[in-house]
C-alpha cells in the first residue's frame, strides 16, 4: 500500500513543498514520485519512505507516489493547489463627470488570481458594497449600474477582490483597484441668459452680463464670453446654484460690422451656449463748418453741416433738403448774430435703433463801437450836492474802451457814484474805441444850484 503526505497542500505560486512517499512493505522494489515539477530527494534512513522537495510550483499539480511491493504496485496522489492574488484589478475607465439622473455602468476587470473557487469580486461605493460576485472567466468581469444622484458627487467607486483561504488555514487576501472618483453635475436645458447692448460704438465700452440658474456644482462651471474672436474676461459671482458673469467689452474700428457675442457655460462634459448679435458702428459727431468763425458785421456767412454718409441731419432744427447727411444756410452777419449758436443734429439708424449726435458752433460777429442816446444820454441835469452815477454804455464786439473828458483832461467818472459839484458841469467828449474803430459823443452835465431864500 502506497501513501502520500500531505495529501492536500495549498501553496503560493512559485513556492516549494515537501512530499513524503511511503509504502507499507519493508523491502519495496521501487518507491518514487512522478511529477513534471523540479524535484530533489532528501536522503532518509530506511527504504520504505522517501521525501521529495518539489519546487517552483506554478500551477495546480497532482504528483503521484508509486511503490512496487511483492504483493503488487500501488499509487497515491497528492493535490497541490497554487494560490495567487489577481495581477490586475481595474475599473473600466469612465468619464469623471456624469450627469445627475444618468445610469452609470461600473465594470470591474480582474486578471488572474487562483484558486478561482475562492475568489470573489466586490464593487463598492466608498465602503458600501454594491455587488459581490464570484470571479469567473479571464478576465473575470463584474458590472453594476448606478443611477447617478447629486449626493454621489465626490464619491469613490472601487473594485476589490477577496481571495478567501481562511478555510484552508490561510488568510483573506484583498486587492483593491485604484478608485474612480465620480463628479456629478446638473446643467439645465435652458441656455444662459445674455444681456448686452445690441449696438456698440467704435472706441467705446459696453457691459455684457451672462447668467444661468439651476447648476450643480456651480463652482465648477466654466464661463466663456467672447465677442467675435475677442475673448472677454468676466468677473463671475456665484449664488447657491447660479452664477452671473459680467465683462466690459471695448471695440475698435477693426470690429465694425455685425459681431457674434457668445456665452458658453461648460460643466462636466456638457455645455450650453447663447448667441447674440452686436452691431459695432462708427458714427462721429456731425461737423459744423462756418466760412469763418469770426466775421465783421455785414459779411456773408455760410454755415454747413456734414455727417456720416448714412445719417440724416437738421441744422438749427431745419431738416436738410433733400433729407440726407448735408445741410447749409446763408446769412448776412448782424450784431444780433454775435454769439449765435448753429446746432447740427445727425440721426443714424443702426440695427433698428436711432442714434443721435449733435455738434454746435458759435458765430462771432465783430461790430461797433456804438454810443447811442439810449445807453449814453447826451444831457444830464443834476442838483448840486446830490449823489449821482453817470452812466454811458458803449457797445461793440470787441467791447470798446470808453473815456469821457472835459477839455481833454477832466474825466467823467462813468459808473461811479459821485457828489455833484459845480466842477462837474460842462460838456464832455465821450470816445469809444475798439479794433473795429472809434466813435465820439458829446455829453453835457448841468448842475442846478439850490435857491437860498
Amino acid at each position: 500500500q502506497t501513501s502520500v503526505s500531505p495529501s492536500k497542500v495549498i501553496l503560493p505560486r512559485g513556492g516549494s513543498v515537501l512530499v513524503t512517499c511511503s509504502t507499507s512493505c519493508d523491502q519495496p522494489k521501487l518507491l518514487g514520485i512522478e511529477t513534471p515539477l523540479p524535484k530533489k530527494e532528501l536522503l532518509l534512513p530506511g527504504n520504505n519512505r522517501k521525501v521529495y522537495e518539489l519546487s517552483n510550483v506554478q500551477e495546480d499539480s497532482q504528483p503521484m507516489c508509486y511503490s512496487n511491493c511483492p504483493d503488487g504496485q500501488s499509487t497515491a496522489k497528492t493535490f497541490l493547489t497554487v494560490y495567487w492574488t489577481p495581477e490586475r484589478v481595474e475599473l473600466a475607465p469612465l468619464p469623471s463627470w456624469q450627469p445627475v439622473g444618468k445610469n452609470l455602468t461600473l465594470r470591474c476587470q480582474v486578471e488572474g488570481g487562483a484558486p478561482r473557487a475562492n475568489l470573489t469580486v466586490v464593487l463598492l461605493r466608498g465602503e458600501k458594497e454594491l455587488k459581490r460576485e464570484p470571479a469567473v472567466g479571464e478576465p473575470a468581469e463584474v458590472t453594476t449600474t448606478v443611477l447617478v444622484r447629486r449626493d454621489h458627487h465626490g464619491a469613490n467607486f472601487s473594485c476589490r477582490t477577496e481571495l478567501d483561504l481562511r478555510p484552508q488555514g490561510l488568510e483573506l487576501f484583498e486587492n483593491t483597484s485604484a478608485p474612480y472618483q465620480l463628479q456629478t453635475f446638473v446643467l439645465p436645458a435652458t441656455p444662459p441668459q445674455l444681456v448686452s447692448p445690441r449696438v456698440l460704438e467704435v472706441d467705446t465700452q459696453g457691459t455684457v452680463v451672462c447668467s444661468l440658474d439651476g447648476l450643480f456644482p456651480v463652482s465648477e462651471a466654466q464661463v466663456h464670453l467672447a465677442l467675435g474672436d475677442q475673448r472677454l474676461n468676466p468677473t463671475v459671482t456665484y449664488g447657491n446654484d447660479s452664477f452671473s458673469a459680467k465683462a466690459s467689452v471695448s471695440v475698435t474700428a477693426e470690429d465694425e460690422g455685425t459681431q457674434r457675442l457668445t456665452c458658453a457655460v461648460i460643466l462636466g462634459n456638457q455645455s450650453q451656449e447663447t448667441l447674440q448679435t452686436v452691431t459695432i458702428y462708427s458714427f462721429p459727431a456731425p461737423n459744423v463748418i462756418l466760412t469763418k468763425p469770426e466775421v465783421s458785421e455785414g459779411t456773408e456767412v455760410t454755415v454747413k453741416c456734414e455727417a456720416h454718409p448714412r445719417a440724416k441731419v437738421t441744422l438749427n432744427g431745419v431738416p436738410a433738403q433733400p433729407l440726407g447727411p448735408r445741410a447749409q444756410l446763408l446769412l448776412k452777419a448782424t450784431p444780433e448774430d454775435n454769439g449765435r449758436s448753429f446746432s447740427c443734429s445727425a440721426t443714424l439708424e443702426v440695427a433698428g435703433q436711432l442714434i443721435h449726435k449733435n455738434q454746435t458752433r458759435e458765430l462771432r460777429v465783430l461790430y461797433g463801437p456804438r454810443l447811442d442816446e439810449r445807453d449814453c444820454p447826451g444831457n444830464w441835469t443834476w442838483p448840486e450836492n446830490s449823489q449821482q452815477t453817470p452812466m454811458c454804455q458803449a457797445w461793440g464786439n470787441p467791447l470798446p474802451e470808453l473815456k469821457c473828458l472835459k477839455d481833454g483832461t477832466f474825466p467823467l467818472p462813468i459808473g461811479e457814484s459821485v457828489t455833484v459839484t459845480r466842477d462837474l458841469e460842462g460838456t464832455y467828449l465821450c470816445r469809444a474805441r475798439s479794433t473795429q474803430g472809434e466813435v465820439t459823443r458829446k455829453v453835457t452835465v448841468n448842475v442846478l444850484s439850490p435857491r437860498y431864500e
Epitope: E87, R88, V89, Q109, E111, G112, R116, V136, G137, E138, P139, E141, A178
Partner: antibody
C-alpha cells in the same frame, strides 16, 4: 498537458483574407485568454490582439484594428484570427499563445505557428 | 509604442560559461499597481517561443534554475549561470505594462 494546435500553412494573394485556427487542450479553455502574435522574416515579434475565451471580448493593437478579427468557439475549444486585405508585408508566422487577458504573467504556452505567405 | 532595445544582438558563449542579455525600455514598465510586467522568452531554432521568466524575475514552470531575471523601471537583465548546448536560440524580452504589448528585437545566443 497543455497544448495549442494551429491550422496549417497558407498561401494567399494580396487583397485576400485568411483565417487561422488555434485549438486548446489539456486545460479548461475558458480559464485563459488567447493572444495572437506574428513573426515576420527579419522582424521582431508583433502582438496582434487578444480574446477573452470566456466572454468573447477582444482588444487589438491599433495597427491591426479593422483588419484583424479574433473570434472563438468555446464548444470546440478553438480561437480564430482572421486577417483581411492581405499585403506582402503580412507574410509571417502567426502564433496563438495562452495567457491572462492582459498578459501579466507572460504567454505561458504557444501554438506551433502557422506560416502565411502573401504573394501575387 | 514602448520600444524594447536588446543588447547584444549576438552572443557567442563557451559552454559552461555565464551569459547576460540586457533589455532596455523607452519608458518605465512599472504598472500603476506597482508590478512590472517584463517577461523573457526563448526561441530555439525552428520552434515556437517558450516562456522563461515572467514579471522580471519569476521562473516559469519547468525552467532550469540556471536562468534568472532581474532589473527594474527601464533596465532589465536575463542571466544564464552556466550555458548548456540546449540554450542555443534567440532570447526575447517582452512587456505587458503598456498597450500595445511589444517585444524586443532578440539576442541570438550561440556556442563559441
Amino acid at each position: 498537458q497543455v497544448q495549442l494546435v494551429q491550422s496549417g500553412a497558407e498561401v494567399k494573394k494580396p487583397g485576400a483574407s485568411v483565417k487561422i485556427s488555434c485549438k486548446g487542450s489539456g486545460y479548461t479553455f475558458t480559464d485563459y485568454a488567447l493572444h495572437w502574435v506574428r513573426q515576420a522574416p527579419g522582424q521582431r515579434l508583433e502582438w496582434i490582439g487578444v480574446i477573452s475565451t470566456y466572454s468573447g471580448n477582444t482588444d487589438y493593437n491599433q495597427k491591426f484594428r479593422g483588419r484583424a478579427t479574433i473570434t472563438r468557439d468555446t464548444s470546440a475549444s478553438t480561437a480564430y484570427m482572421e486577417l483581411s486585405s492581405l499585403r506582402s508585408e503580412d507574410t509571417a508566422v502567426y502564433y496563438c499563445a495562452r495567457s491572462l487577458y492582459f498578459g501579466s504573467s507572460g504567454f505561458d504556452y504557444w501554438g506551433q505557428g502557422t506560416a502565411l505567405t502573401v504573394s501575387s | 509604442d514602448v520600444v524594447l532595445t536588446q543588447s547584444p544582438l549576438s552572443l557567442p558563449v563557451t559552454l559552461g560559461q555565464p551569459a547576460s542579455i540586457s533589455c532596455r525600455s523607452s519608458q518605465t514598465l512599472v504598472y500603476r499597481n506597482g508590478n512590472t510586467y517584463l517577461h523573457w522568452y526563448q526561441q530555439r531554432p525552428g520552434q515556437s517561443p517558450r516562456l522563461l521568466i515572467y514579471k522580471v524575475s519569476n521562473r516559469f514552470s519547468g525552467v532550469p534554475d540556471r536562468f534568472s531575471g532581474s532589473g527594474s523601471g527601464t533596465d532589465f537583465t536575463l542571466k544564464i549561470s552556466r550555458v548548456e548546448a540546449e540554450d542555443v536560440g534567440v532570447y526575447f524580452c517582452s512587456q505587458n505594462t503598456h498597450f500595445p504589448y511589444t517585444f524586443g528585437g532578440g539576442t541570438k545566443l550561440e556556442i563559441k
